[in-house]
């Protein structure tokens, strides 16, 4: 309740997160008439990426383009990219939708289609759908520890969300353990009314709101966080217009002294931690 006699001050905050969990992934890669089943273990270093600010990212799905090398090759025959003669291909042209620089030649992509040859990382990335169900759908059971230090400089008051009495094996629950700062990712989605399994396919952005409503008067002192969760990306975006959340990164290696890379299109959840609130004191 608003205490008009108090001097109010907005919170100053710093956040640090630690994600834990292991995922076992079975992926099917079909090419050239062979479906290769690969089994791999993903740990924190494989699925989390350091982000700026109060955010962390958990990869839930991916599409790989393996064995790419810098050379000449036909570009992927996306809509409008096919050609029938060299006239359609412009030497030196860099189409923003393309993955390379055109050489001016129209070459066979496969038995039935021809596309402009490009200088690029080859073979160029195919436009593949994100696997369904998501490869790291078990990320639902990962946990994140959120450390939140806050400060009210005008009141010379500092505290944090983790208390010395807290049990390191607790898990946040709105009713049973609302002060635990270890959150199961699936629970965050459930609290926000979202389906983790579904969002994991294309990715998305989830907000973790930490609200501090602090009464710093000694006779009725109270300063503990309240956690709430809501989805921040537009889940109703037309499917054809860049749904979800994804980015690309590459792993580079050498094979027979030739530099190669595996391109990975990573889909996942970006968690934004939004800290707000006030401290009031007479």
């Amino acid at each position: 309740s608003d205490k008009l006699y108090q001097r109010k001050e907005p919170v100053i905050s710093s956040v640090h997160t630690k994600v834990k969990g292991i995922a076992e992934v079975t992926e099917n890669v079909t090419e050239g008439g062979v479906t290769k089943l690969g089994h791999s273990i993903f740990d924190t270093a494989d699925y989390t990426f350091p982000l700026q600010g109060n955010s962390f990212f958990v990869m839930t799905n991916y599409v790989k383009s393996e064995g790419q090398v810098q050379t000449l090759c036909p570009e992927y025959p996306r809509r409008g990219a096919q050609c029938s003669s060299d006239r359609r291909c412009k030497k030196g042209w860099m189409d923003p939708q393309s993955k390379g620089i055109q050489t001016g030649r129209c070459v066979p992509y496969d038995k039935t289609r021809k596309t402009c040859e490009v200088s690029a990382w080859c073979p160029t990335e195919e436009e593949k759908e994100a696997p369904r169900p998501a490869l790291l759908r078990s990320a639902e059971n990962f946990t994140v520890l959120i450390k939140n230090n806050i400060h009210f400089p005008g009141h010379n008051y500092t505290t944090r969300n983790i208390l010395p009495t807290m049990n390191g094996s607790c898990t946040f629950h709105k009713t049973w353990d609302p002060q635990c700062s270890i959150f199961r990712l699936g629970d965050i989605f459930q609290e926000a009314g979202e389906n983790f399994t579904e969002v994991a396919v294309q990715g998305g952005i989830m907000g973790i709101e930490i609200y501090w409503d602090c009464n710093l008067d000694s006779w009725s002192h109270h300063c503990r966080p309240r956690y709430s969760f809501r989805r921040l990306d537009d889940k109703n975006t037309d499917e054809s217009f860049v749904p979800g959340y994804n980015f690309r990164y590459a792993k580079y290696y050498k094979e027979n002294n030739v530099e190669k890379r595996t391109l990975i299109k990573a889909f996942g959840i970006r968690f934004d931690i939004l800290v707000f609130g006030t401290g009031g004191k007479f």
Epitope: G32, G33, V34, T35, K36, L37
Partner: nanobody, 128 residues
């Protein structure tokens, strides 16, 4: 009509080598992956090696580093070079065109994509 004809089988001593050939007609190796399967008496049929239609090779754990699968330049014949043969390699070897699954060193037919096209087989006997 798709046809696969194996040749090159025979009797060989332990540690010896053999080269099996599979002549394909009625399709090209761009259309299908080609695999070698084998069946020993009283045992289940097992996949030995695959040459995918884009030129990638796969081997069962039991033959890795001993067997090698290749194709000729015209992509009409597939070869299985078998070195350091053991009595356990004794079987009828079949050449198969189709779709396959490679799972942690085990090769099987992708039955969801059909039963494939099979040759008549070539007998390989390794004596000790």
């Amino acid at each position: 009509e798709v046809q696969l004809v194996e040749s090159g089988g025979g009797l060989v001593q332990t540690g010896g080598s053999l080269r099996l050939s599979c002549a394909a007609s009625g399709f090209t190796l761009d259309d299908y992956a080609i695999a070698w399967f084998r069946q020993a008496p009283g045992k289940e049929r097992e996949g030995v090696s695959i040459l995918s239609s884009i030129g990638k090779t796969f081997y069962a754990d039991s033959v890795k580093d001993r067997f090698s699968i290749t194709a000729d330049g015209a992509k009409t014949t597939v070869f299985l070079q078998m070195n350091s043969l053991k009595p356990g390699d004794t079987a009828i070897y079949y050449c198969v065109a189709g779709h396959f699954v490679y799972n942690d060193g085990a090769i099987s037919l992708n039955t969801a994509r059909g039963s494939g096209f099979w040759g008549q087989g070539a007998q390989v006997t390794v004596s000790s």
